[in-house]
Every structure is written in structure tokens, then in C-alpha cells.
Amino acid sequence: FRDCAEVFKSGHTTNGIYTLTFPNSTEEIKAYCDMEAGGGGWTIIQRREDGSVDFQRTWKEYKVGFGNPSGEYWLGNEFVSQLTNQQRYVLKIHLKDWEGNEAYSLYEHFYLSSEELNYRIHLKGLTGTAGKISSISQPGNDFSTKDGDNDKCICKCSQMLTGGWWFDACGPSNLNGMYYPQRQNTNAFNGIKWYYWKGSGYSLKATTMMIRPADF
């Protein structure tokens, strides 16, 4: 299976971890598939929920992925890049705050450039409840990590804010920032940020980034 949409269409309609195959390759990767939300078929590419996994990782770790697909994890930039360059994908970002509220941002078009172009993110067609303005700067920025500084700041955003992300200078979001528990999650400049929903100092409780073919 190339993605969770193919898994779903093959008759596997239960949430869980499935083995996916890189496009035009035999290389495999394990991913969590959400087969319930919004019709199912979603490939989860990022999840934060409890702070159990360190997201201050190297370029290579963000490239190949890390964490546990059943919990907190990053699927891997290389796989996502290859996948989203095969056909048109949508990206849905689901967010939870500490007060029991939920919101989402849905981008009708999403792809990552190749590693040679630093996995630059490309997004279009924003809808959803997590802000009318995109909290991922547009047009998209290159991906940066603690050992791969590609941002637009004279500072090093990834080191300052922690985590790998498509930093601008440094920009209005970072879903891979430090995980702060409840009551420590305000005035957290290096936390899990989605500015156009909760502002700059608020660190979120949970986030999920998921993709699905646009023609699903």
C-alpha cells in the first residue's frame, strides 16, 4: 500500500498501524491510519499528545521518521515528499487546547519538495476553524532542524524554539516544539504553537497532521 487511502480502499477500515511502501520502491515504513475521521483513509504524518517523545531531533531523524506510530511520532519527510509528489494531497491539521476545545486547518493542496530543496512545504486553499490566516507561513519555507538551519532568521529558530519545522523568521507556528503540561503551557515561547488559533505563547495539548489524496 502506498498510503492509508489505499489501505482503506482495500477493505481495511480499522484504525491502526499499517505497513506502507515508498513510491517506486520496495522500502517500507510503518504509519498510523485514521480510518474514521472525515471518511477515513488518512495517513498520520505527525502526532503530539503527551510529551513522551523528544522532538528536538536531527535532520536525518526528521528525514526517516521517529517515535511510535501508535503514539507521538513523525512519519518522515522523505516518505511524505515522495508520496505528495506522486499526486495531489490534502493536509488536515487537528489541534486540541487544554480547555477542551478543538480546531482544524485544512489545506486543499499540499506537497513537500525534495531533500535537495530542504523539504520545502507548499500549501494552498486554507479552510477550517483554526484561523483564517495560515499559521504555516506562505509561500512555504524550507524545513529546519537543530543541525540544519534553513530559516530566514539570523537566529537559529530550530535551536531557539526547539524541534524541526518550516520556520520563517521564526514564524507563526511550530507543532514540533517543546511539550508543556497543563498550567505550564502559557507564556511558552518554544512550545507547540499555532498562532492564528491560540496566539504566540500558548502551547497546545495535542496535534495531529494527516494527509489524504484529494480525489479520495
Epitope: 493542496h109 519538495s113 525534495s114 535537495e116 507548499h122 509561500p139
Partner: antibody, heavy 121, light 107 residues
Framework: DVQLQESGPGLVKPSQSLSLTCTVT?????????WNWIRQFPGNKLEWMGY???????SYNPSLKSRISITRDTSKNQFFLQLNSVTPEDTATYYC??????????????WGQGTSVTVSS | SIVMTQTPKLLLVSAGDRVTITCKAS??????VAWYQQKPGQSPKLLIY???NRYTGVPDRFTGSGYGTDFTFAISTVQAEDLAIYFC?????????FGGGTKLEIK
């Protein structure tokens, strides 16, 4: 710096085909983004004609779909416009431009200087 | 396709004036609207993208705003070199479409 340069005949006869070339320097057309053709009619009206993406996929304006073809030569870093069965209404200045998104239409950040094409017998 | 209705067609202003151009989309274009400047004898130049983001190197006297169907472009203090035609463009849906243009003339 990224530069685009259009070239092709300035005069085309009605019912013939219009063929233009856009030569790109400073960026590989196979790396990223979409590579567009836009035309500007006398009176300044702008019309997007279509693009070829870095991956080679194409998208065309439905108003031209039966007449238009956009192709590329990656070895020369060029992309091409062919417009068939032209009429005097196709008289315009033709621009090539790079758009900021590779798989869909978007704003265009680099433009060629344009080439004027007259359709007349 | 989305029709972009741009007004006014002509603006006659003095240096130092503030000018505003509007574009109305026939259906929602979200914030996927760009503004271009075309000086005489030149190709269009991107000024504003995603409705309100200034493109690299564009002076801060140029601003854009709007969401959905109503979009505004403004020049806070017009200078002589701003003599040009200004176009809006939506790229929310394909095909992308342009407004008819606003010609800015300096008195």
C-alpha cells in the same frame, strides 16, 4: 537570479500554429514550481493560458484546452507553448512566468519580458 | 471560473496621496489573491500574495487586505514611480483569473 526569456515569431498567419519558447536560467524547471504561459491582449486584459509543472504534468485554461499544448525540454531548461488554429483574436503579448506552487495555480513571482505576436495574413 | 471585478479603471492622483483599489470575486477566493504592478513597457511584477503578504523587496507603502470575496490594495503615499497599471489575480481555483486593471496616473 531566476530569469525567463520568451522567443518565437512575431507574425503568424490565421489558421496556423503559434509556437513560442521560454528559456529559463538560474533555476532548473524540474526542481520545483510550475511554469506558466500568460497573454495580454491589446487593452491590457490578462489571460492565464496554462502551465507545465516541475514534474511534467500540465494544466490548461478550459477556454483554450482544444488548441493548446505546453511541453518542455529539460536538457535545455526550456518550456514551450503551441497554440493551434490561431485567429486575429490571438494577437497579444505572450509572457512566460514561474508560479510559487508546483502542483496547482498560484501567484507568479518571475516573469519574462514578453514577446509580441500578431496574427494576420 | 471566478470573475474578478476591479475598480476603478482609472485613478488620477497627486504625489503624496493615498489610493485604494478594490477587487470583488464572483465567489470566495479564500485569501488566494495576488496584486501586480505593470509599468509601461514592462512585464507585471508581483507586489502582494495571499491577499496581504508583501513580496520580497516591495516597499511597505504597498498593502493588501481582504478575505473571501472582497479585496483591497492600497498605496499609502503615492510616488511618481508608482505610475503603472495594477492588477488583482485570484488563484484559489483553476483557471486563475485577473481583474481588468486599474491605471494609476499622476497629475
Amino acid at each position: 537570479d531566476v530569469q525567463l526569456q520568451e522567443s518565437g515569431p512575431g507574425l503568424v498567419k490565421p489558421s496556423q500554429s503559434l509556437s513560442l519558447t521560454c528559456t529559463v536560467t538560474g533555476y532548473s524547471i524540474t526542481s520545483d514550481y510550475a511554469w506558466n504561459w500568460i497573454r495580454q491582449f491589446p487593452g491590457n486584459k490578462l489571460e492565464w493560458m496554462g502551465y507545465i509543472s516541475y514534474s511534467g504534468s500540465t494544466s490548461y485554461n478550459p477556454s483554450l484546452k482544444s488548441r493548446i499544448s505546453i511541453t518542455r525540454d529539460t536538457s535545455k531548461n526550456q518550456f514551450f507553448l503551441q497554440l493551434n488554429s490561431v485567429t486575429p483574436e490571438d494577437t497579444a503579448t505572450y509572457y512566460c512566468a514561474r508560479s510559487t506552487f508546483g502542483h496547482y495555480v498560484s501567484s507568479m513571482d518571475y516573469w519574462g519580458q514578453g514577446t509580441s505576436v500578431t496574427v494576420s495574413s | 471560473s471566478i470573475v474578478m471585478t476591479q475598480t476603478p479603471k482609472l485613478l488620477l492622483v497627486s504625489a503624496g496621496d493615498r489610493v485604494t483599489i478594490t477587487c470583488k470575486a464572483s465567489q470566495s477566493a479564500s485569501n488566494d489573491v495576488a496584486w501586480y504592478q505593470q509599468k509601461p513597457g514592462q512585464s507585471p511584477k508581483l507586489l502582494i500574495y495571499y491577499a496581504s503578504n508583501r513580496y520580497t523587496g516591495v516597499p511597505d507603502r504597498f498593502t493588501g487586505s481582504g478575505y473571501g470575496t472582497d479585496f483591497t490594495f492600497a498605496i499609502s503615499t503615492v510616488q511618481a514611480e508608482d505610475l503603472a497599471i495594477y492588477f488583482c489575480q485570484q488563484d484559489y481555483s483553476s483557471p486563475p483569473t485577473f481583474g481588468g486593471g486599474t491605471k494609476l496616473e499622476i497629475k
